[in-house]
Interface confidence: low
């Protein structure tokens, strides 16, 4: 019975994260936060790099490291696969570049099973990206 | 070009209030961490207070919680300090500076300052 | 709150040296650290962010590293425009700290 309270999944309070096609979680999360309320704030830097547009899977993959999966079957919270990892910091490491900025040591592709399998369970990213996403907001690397 | 233009600044009485104001340029402050950083005269830096337009985030110092109150208007790009119940200690020039997200936001350009005396 | 504990609070070097400065963070901060500069009656200068990364435009004489809850800012070999006051900075999540300073001058 204790077991089974221990892990017991949390429903996602963090709004950015809601309606990705998993709504529980269970901390702490895959960078060491205990708490929601602390993932939600590291969370909120990266919300300008979602308006710009980047990638489409930026935010889900963001979500998937500060509110991994959980289920009540598996007691480890399930995040990303190493393959949409990579998607996204090819698209988008080039954009946190043009401020002098680099890819998060803590969104290290290499810390993320390579893909889903019984031995590591991962979430793939919601479809492909062939086509670029256009800048959604006011800025753009020129603005530097 | 970004840049950050600090004004307001001023002598005080002990008690009294003040509004300083950072204007920004050359980038969308909305999208940005806008904090305002302190520094007394012959000290070191102090962080006083962030605040997040996107989402409506603020967070102060303890040693300023109560008294002061970040705030930004994003239809002037600017972010403001508004500051009352002035104590002698208040005494320092204030930074205003942004941060760009992710990277543990880091603040990567900062305005010129403007000095706030409170005395009697 | 976590604070910052910088050393040392001031050294005198020559141009050419190599200069160490240190910070220990109270708990852990995971990387979220970065070193400014600062010269007299100016505002603060980043060098670097996330512990090691090199900002932009800044000389790669400037590095930075972590030991656990250590902190260090190195000047590989000083630069007479380097003769400044430096500061770390931690940012964990609502609160941000800074070190005390280190005022490097000339010997």
């Known amino acids: 019975f204790g077991d089974e309270e221990e892990r017991r999944c949390d429903p996602i309070r963090i709004s950015m994260c809601q309606n990705l096609g998993y709504n529980v979680t269970k901390m702490p999360n895959l960078v060491g936060h205990e708490l929601q309320t602390d993932a939600e704030l590291q969370l909120t830097t990266f919300t300008p790099l979602i308006q710009y547009g980047c990638s489409s899977q930026l935010q889900f993959f963001l979500c998937s490291v500060y509110v991994p999966m959980c289920t009540e079957k598996i007691n480890i919270p399930i995040g990303p696969c190493g393959g949409m990892c990579l998607s996204v910091k090819r698209r988008c490491e080039p954009v946190l570049k043009e401020f002098g900025f680099a890819w998060p040591e803590s969104l290290n592709c290499s810390k993320f099973p390579p893909q889903n399998d019984h031995n590591h369970m991962c979430m793939e990213g919601p479809g492909d990206e062939e086509v670029p996403l256009p800048h959604k907001t006011p800025i753009q690397p020129g603005e530097e | 070009e970004v840049q950050l233009v600090e004004s307001g600044g001023g002598l005080v009485q002990p008690g009294g209030s003040l509004r300083l104001s950072c204007a920004a340029s050359?980038?969308?402050?909305?999208?940005?961490?806008m904090h305002w950083v302190r520094q007394a005269p012959g000290k070191g830096l102090e962080w006083v207070a962030t605040v997040y337009p996107y989402l409506d985030y603020t967070y102060y110092a303890d040693s300023v919680k109560g008294r002061f109150t970040i705030s930004a208007d994003t239809s002037k790009n600017t972010a403001y300090l508004q500051m009352n119940s002035l104590r002698a200690e208040d005494t320092a020039v204030y930074y205003c500076?942004?941060?760009?997200?992710?990277?543990?936001?880091?603040?990567?350009?900062w305005g010129q300052g403007t000095l706030v005396t409170v005395s009697s | 709150d976590i604070q910052m504990t910088q050393s040392p609070s001031s050294l005198s070097a020559s141009v050419g040296d190599r200069v160490t400065i240190t910070c220990r963070a109270s708990q852990s901060v995971s990387s979220a650290v970065a070193w400014y500069q600062q010269k007299p009656g100016k505002a603060p200068k980043l060098l670097i962010y996330?512990?090691?990364s090199l900002y932009s435009g800044v000389p790669s004489r400037f590095s930075g590293s972590r030991s656990g809850t250590d902190f260090t800012l190195t000047i590989s070999s000083l630069q007479p425009e380097d003769f400044a006051t430096y500061y770390c900075q931690q940012s964990s999540y609502s609160l941000i700290t800074f070190g005390q300073g280190t005022k490097v001058e000339i010997k």
């Open positions: 050359g980038f969308n402050s909305s999208f940005y961490f």
């Open positions: 500076a942004r941060a760009f997200p992710g990277s543990y936001h880091p603040m990567d350009y």
């Open positions: 996330s512990a090691s």
